[in-house]
Interface confidence: medium
């Protein structure tokens, strides 16, 4: 079938509506053409002439089919804690998202208005809920038998190593230290085990299921741009 020809402007019959990419002009009382993305209405339609469209100027845009008299201004340049993930063009607004290690504390329709650094859990606390693009990290105290010796926004509480003979018992912020006798956990024979550097752990490691003695979830700290809470640092 041939393409359907749009004879705009035309009057819509009562009960009907203007077609896709057309709008009803109240003054002309006609169905008139919309302007394509990247354009705006320079001259509105009349009973005998259709809409005249013009391209958006630099730093302005229209994302949808429209009949606006002026294009929208692109948002201001991205701040230092943001990354420009979509440039300003005639057809789309600039989109700024938070750089790694930050989350969006105040979002807007597209992108982020205000970024904040992800909370870091201090030693003795691990990540209960990881940060996302729009939510902060939630820290929790390490349960008995687990520890975290780092200040990190990604590290979870890890289980203490199990020693045949304990030299120094572990606590919430330090791993157990074994005597020269090999610990149950696999390691080089005769060596005193020290915890591995946290950086080698995957950010996506799931929190270890906790024993029945673990504190209740009432210990979970609030999400969102709250002031540093116990177990977290402000830096």
């Amino acid at each position: 079938l041939p393409a359907q020809v749009a004879f705009t402007p035309y009057a819509p019959e009562p009960g009907s509506t203007c077609r896709l990419r057309e709008y009803y002009d109240q003054t002309a009382q006609m169905c008139c053409s919309k302007c394509s993305p990247g354009q705006h209405a320079k001259v509105f339609c009349t009973k005998t002439s259709d809409t005249v469209c013009d391209s958006c100027e630099d730093s302005t845009y229209t994302q949808l089919w429209n009949w606006v008299p002026e294009c929208l201004s692109c948002g201001s340049r991205c701040s230092s804690d943001q990354v420009e993930t979509q440039a300003c063009t005639r057809e789309q607004n600039r989109i700024c998202t938070c750089r790694p290690g930050w989350y969006c504390a105040l979002s807007k329709q597209e992108g982020c208005r205000l970024c904040a650094p992800l909370r870091k859990c201090r030693p003795g606390f691990g990540v209960a809920r990881p940060g996302t693009e729009t939510s902060d990290v939630v820290c929790k105290p390490c349960a008995p038998g687990t520890f975290s010796n780092t200040t990190s926004s990604t590290d979870i509480c890890r289980p203490h190593q199990i020693c045949n003979v304990v030299a120094i018992p572990g606590n919430a912020s330090m791993d157990a230290v074994c005597t020269s006798t090999s610990p149950t956990r696999s390691m080089a024979p005769g060596a005193v085990h020290l915890p591995q550097p946290v950086s080698t752990r995957s950010q996506h490691t799931q929190p270890t299921p906790e024993p029945s003695t673990a504190p209740s979830t009432s210990f979970l700290l609030p999400m969102g741009p709250s002031p540093p809470a116990e177990g977290s640092t402000g830096d």
């Epitope: 359907q4 020809v5 004879f7 009057a11 019959e13 009960g15 009907s16 077609r19 009973k47």
Partner: antibody, heavy 120, light 111 residues
Framework: EVQLLESGGGLVQPGGSLRLSCAAS????????MSWVRQAPGKGLEWVST????????WYADSVKGRFTISRDNSKNTLYLQMNSLRAEDTAVYYC?????????????WGQGTLVTVSS | QSVLTQPPSASGTPGQRVTISCTGS?????????VHWYQQLPGTAPKLLIY???NRPSGVPDRFSGSKSGTSASLAISGLRSEDEADYYC???????????FGGGTKLTVL
């Protein structure tokens, strides 16, 4: 298959009443405006009435205004035309028709028609 | 008398091109309302032939075309065939009547 089937026509005396029905099938009835169009023997087409999909708005030809009522029951996929105070000049084949889409409103599906004869 | 005026008859020989006119006024075609064309073969219900001035529903051959200018519209049939012998009606909305109006119809004869 999209279909419209009219019924209810027949012989009626002047001043009498008749109710025409149009059973729709094969499409989402409530989404379409519907019309009644009539054709007197040997004459051209004459628009009678239109009703939008929801039933909220109706229009009538001057020749039937105040005597005919168009209505629809979307739960039964049926269009109606209640005809009162019938006159000899109302004698015609009555067609129900569906309007295409929401835009141009051409009548793209027609029933086979039902004959209404008003005579004493 | 119909609000939209059509010639009562038109004729042509097979293969010929025939045009049927439909003249309205400032309250219907001239007001910007689109024109629809219907074909009624003898003894059958009407069929939508052209809608929105120039658009063909699926199944309608491209021998049929419609156009509109000012207060009138026209239907053109090229490569005329014997099966095109029928009555043709134009229709549009009319503001002053607040209703849909049909032309009086044109009987097309293929000689």
């Amino acid at each position: 298959e999209v279909q419209l089937l009219e019924s209810g026509g027949g012989l009626v005396q002047p001043g009498g009443s008749l109710r025409l029905s149009c059973a729709a099938s094969g499409f989402t009835f409530s989404s379409y405006a519907m019309s009644w169009v009539r054709q007197a023997p040997g004459k051209g087409l004459e628009w009678v009435s239109t009703i939008i999909g929801s039933g909220a708005n109706t229009w009538y030809a001057d020749s039937v205004k105040g005597r005919f009522t168009i209505s629809r029951d979307n739960s039964k996929n049926t269009l109606y035309l209640q005809m009162n105070s019938l006159r000899a000049e109302d004698t015609a084949v009555y067609y129900c028709a569906r309007h295409e889409g929401y835009y141009y409103y051409g009548m793209d599906v027609w029933g086979q028609g039902t004959l209404v004869t008003v005579s004493s | 008398q119909s609000v939209l005026t059509q010639p009562p008859s038109a004729s042509g020989t097979p293969g010929q091109r025939v045009t049927i006119s439909c003249t309205g006024s400032s309250s219907n075609i001239g007001a910007g309302y689109v024109v629809h064309w219907y074909q009624q073969l003898p003894g059958t219900a009407p069929k939508l032939l052209i809608y929105g001035n120039s658009n063909r529903p699926s199944g309608v051959p491209d021998r049929f075309s419609g156009s509109k200018s000012g207060t009138s519209a026209s239907l053109a049939i090229s490569g005329l065939r014997s099966e095109d012998e029928a009555d043709y009606y134009c229709a549009a909305w009319d503001d002053s009547l607040n209703g849909r109006v049909f032309g009086g119809g044109t009987k097309l004869t293929v000689l």
